[in-house]
Interface confidence: low
């Protein structure tokens, strides 16, 4: 058993039929010695008396809020949560496996630049009685600070008969050094509590590997005289690291016909302009990627040829 | 060239070669991004590589103040990786494919390090750790890790030279 936060405890249980469970001793936080009784949740049934209560925790029915009282007055509470271990593996019932970029990916994170700010998100089909707490650090043995905000519900989607909820959190490395070569990964730890079930999820990454720039901005077309060619120009996204002479992007320019089957013309360039042939009903799209490190491409910025 | 007196390197040449290094490092092991090599244990094998750290003056401000600190660190790393790519980790079994970019990568590391340091002037270089993996699969894993680490190192070096070429060239 360990303390998650004040008055909230996690009991780790091997989860199999007829498992013996864990013996837990609860102590009433009071100077009183006599006349103390214990109850569980809303029940008025007295579970025991005395300053301590010993219980055998085997299943969710044994978890919950234990309260000690004296003469009708509440003295203190202890909330017991269960963390299940099945076949040596901690349960992952609360969050959905996103399966990208590989199986057992519960947390996904992205950064728009090298400032040390990043966003992580996760999915669940659970809509109520759900809380998340997020901690992060750079490195684990001698951790350096990363400050995370509160996790918030950021999207709701309908998937077949099910509703899916997306939660996200923003974190910022306290002492970020955008120009350095990272040697220790960022660690992200999410505590998830659904009713009386506790689970934890972790992700480990370098900022450089989760970079995904915003799309290029101010995408414009300038027809060239007496020609089907146009000059496409764009700018670095506002959110990208500066100076751009140091944090450089490379770009992919694509001409795409109305039909998805039509051949796509693609040009790669380090400049912020390119000359392409604009076909009727086609559109021109541009996306960006770090010039020197092959992390994710941005989403496309598009403009119609007409 | 970065000479003992501390004059500027050939920023544009360094920029071109370092950008080529980035391309080669990724073509040498493009899929490495989809493998979480940090789960594979064996940390000490890549812990000793020289990283371009926060205080090495490789940020835009540090380069403007005095680029020598940074260039020295980059040179140190280039020599280190050049030695690793020439060691039995890459020359031993399983053999690299004949058209593997590792050979080109090795040559380019040497080329850039020589651009930074003319003959007769020696910056101190870091000792290469003695890594002699016994099993071919260990050697394969070590190659992935070294290339992954090299990708990060040359990205920073390329940024430095691009910025230098744009803002510090005479």
């Amino acid at each position: 058993i360990w303390e998650l936060k004040k008055d909230v405890y996690v009991v780790e249980l091997d989860w199999y039929p007829d498992a013996p469970g864990e013996m837990v001793v609860l102590t009433c936080d009071t100077p009183e010695e006599d006349g103390i009784t214990w109850t569980l949740d809303q029940s008025s049934e007295v579970l025991g008396s005395g300053k301590t209560l010993t219980i055998q925790v085997k299943e969710f029915g044994d978890a919950g809020q234990y309260t000690c009282h004296k003469g009708g007055e509440v003295l203190s509470h202890s909330l017991l949560l269960l963390h299940k271990k099945e076949d040596g593996i901690w349960s992952t019932d609360i969050l959905k496996d996103q399966k990208e970029p590989k199986n057992k990916t519960f947390l996904r994170c992205e950064a728009k630049n090298y400032s040390g700010r990043f966003t992580c998100w996760w999915l669940t089909t659970i809509s109520t009685d759900l809380t998340f707490s997020v901690k992060s650090s750079r490195g684990s043995s001698d951790p350096q600070g990363v400050t995370c905000g509160a996790a918030t519900l950021s999207a709701e989607r309908v998937r077949g008969d099910n509703k899916e909820y997306e939660y996200s959190v923003e974190c910022q490395e306290d002492s970020a050094c955008p120009a350095a070569e990272e040697s220790l990964p960022i660690e992200v730890m999410v505590d998830a509590v659904h009713k009386l079930k506790y689970e934890n999820y972790t992700s480990s990454f370098f900022i450089r590997d989760i970079i995904k720039p915003d799309p290029p901005k101010n995408l414009q077309l300038k027809p060239l005289k007496n020609s089907r060619q146009v000059e496409v120009s764009w700018e670095y996204p506002d959110t990208w690291s500066t100076p751009h002479s140091y944090f450089s992007l490379t770009f992919c320019v694509q001409v795409q016909g109305k039909s998805k089957r039509e051949k796509k013309d693609r040009v790669f360039t380090d400049k912020t302009s390119a000359t392409v042939i604009c076909r009727k009903n086609a559109s021109i799209s541009v996306r960006a990627q770090d010039r020197y490190y092959s992390s994710s491409w941005s989403e496309w910025a598009s403009v119609p040829c007409s | 060239r970065a000479v003992p007196g501390g004059s500027s390197p050939a920023w544009t040449q360094c920029q071109q070669l370092s950008q080529k290094l980035c391309t080669l490092a990724w073509s040498a092991h493009p899929l490495v991004g989809h493998m979480d090599l940090r789960e594979e244990g064996d940390e000490e094998t890549t812990n000793d590589v020289p990283h371009i750290q926060c205080g090495d003056g490789c940020d835009p401000q540090g380069l403007r103040d005095n680029s020598q600190f940074c260039l020295q660190r980059i040179h140190q790393g280039l020599i280190f990786y050049e030695k690793l790519l020439g060691s039995d980790i890459f020359t031993g079994e399983p053999s690299l494919l004949p058209d593997s970019p590792v050979g080109q990568l090795h040559a380019s590391l040497l080329g850039l390090s020589q651009l930074l340091q003319p003959e007769g002037h020696h910056w101190e270089t870091q000792q290469i750790p003695s890594l002699s993996p016994s099993q071919p699969w260990q050697r394969l894993l070590l190659r992935f890790k070294i290339l992954r680490s090299l990708q990060a190192f040359v990205a920073v070096a390329a940024r430095v030279f691009a910025h230098g070429a744009a803002t510090l060239s005479p």
């Epitope: - | 750290q53 926060c54 205080g55 090495d56």
Partner: antibody
Framework: QVQLVESGGGLVKPGRSLRLSCAAS????????MHWVRQAPGKGLEWVAV????????YYADSVKGRFTISRDNSKNTLYLQMNSLRAEDTAVYYC??????????????WGQGTTVTVSS | QSVLTQPPSVSGAPGQRVTFSCTGS?????????VHWYQQFPGRAPKLLIY???NRPSGVPDRFSGSKSGASASLAITGLQVEDEADYYC???????????FGGGTQLTVLG
Amino acid sequence: QVQLVESGGGLVKPGRSLRLSCAASGFTFSSYAMHWVRQAPGKGLEWVAVISYDGSNKYYADSVKGRFTISRDNSKNTLYLQMNSLRAEDTAVYYCAKEKGMVRGYGMDVWGQGTTVTVSS
Amino acid sequence: QSVLTQPPSVSGAPGQRVTFSCTGSDSNIGAGYDVHWYQQFPGRAPKLLIYGTNNRPSGVPDRFSGSKSGASASLAITGLQVEDEADYYCQTFDTRLIASVFGGGTQLTVLG
């Protein structure tokens, strides 16, 4: 516990030199940038110099540039400030301070008690 | 003349809220550099109170908070206490001077 102890202050004539030391304990000295900050009698704080965690980068205030040299010996967990060509306006309490990060920019989270330098003829 | 401008003094009664301003320029606070705040009692070394514009080191009460807008920063103390009477300094980095810079300091007087 984390501690910085300055020494080497005293009374010195204008034009002369003085070397201040700062002994660090209770933290990994070689992982942090270190500063010297001074405070003239009845005045505010004035930043003097900083040195990066490994000694490779050093920066100085314009008022001391060319006269003062900051250095460190990581094997001895000691920071130094060599002060040459001292002037009356260098009279102050000199503090050494630990940066929260490897380089400057994250705040000075540990300070010594200060050592007094008086420059007077 | 400090690069960062702070008012020489502010005062407030116990329990009140007081704010300290720190005005810079676009080569320091306005360039996006973090602002740090220090508290100094007479005859004592300064103590880091707020770092990275709005983060409190452990042991600093949550009565102290920092914020930044454009080229200015401010420190706020809520529920003012007699023991808060001290000098308060802001500090940041100036990219033009390539130097760390302090404000001139503000003396806080707790009335009463």
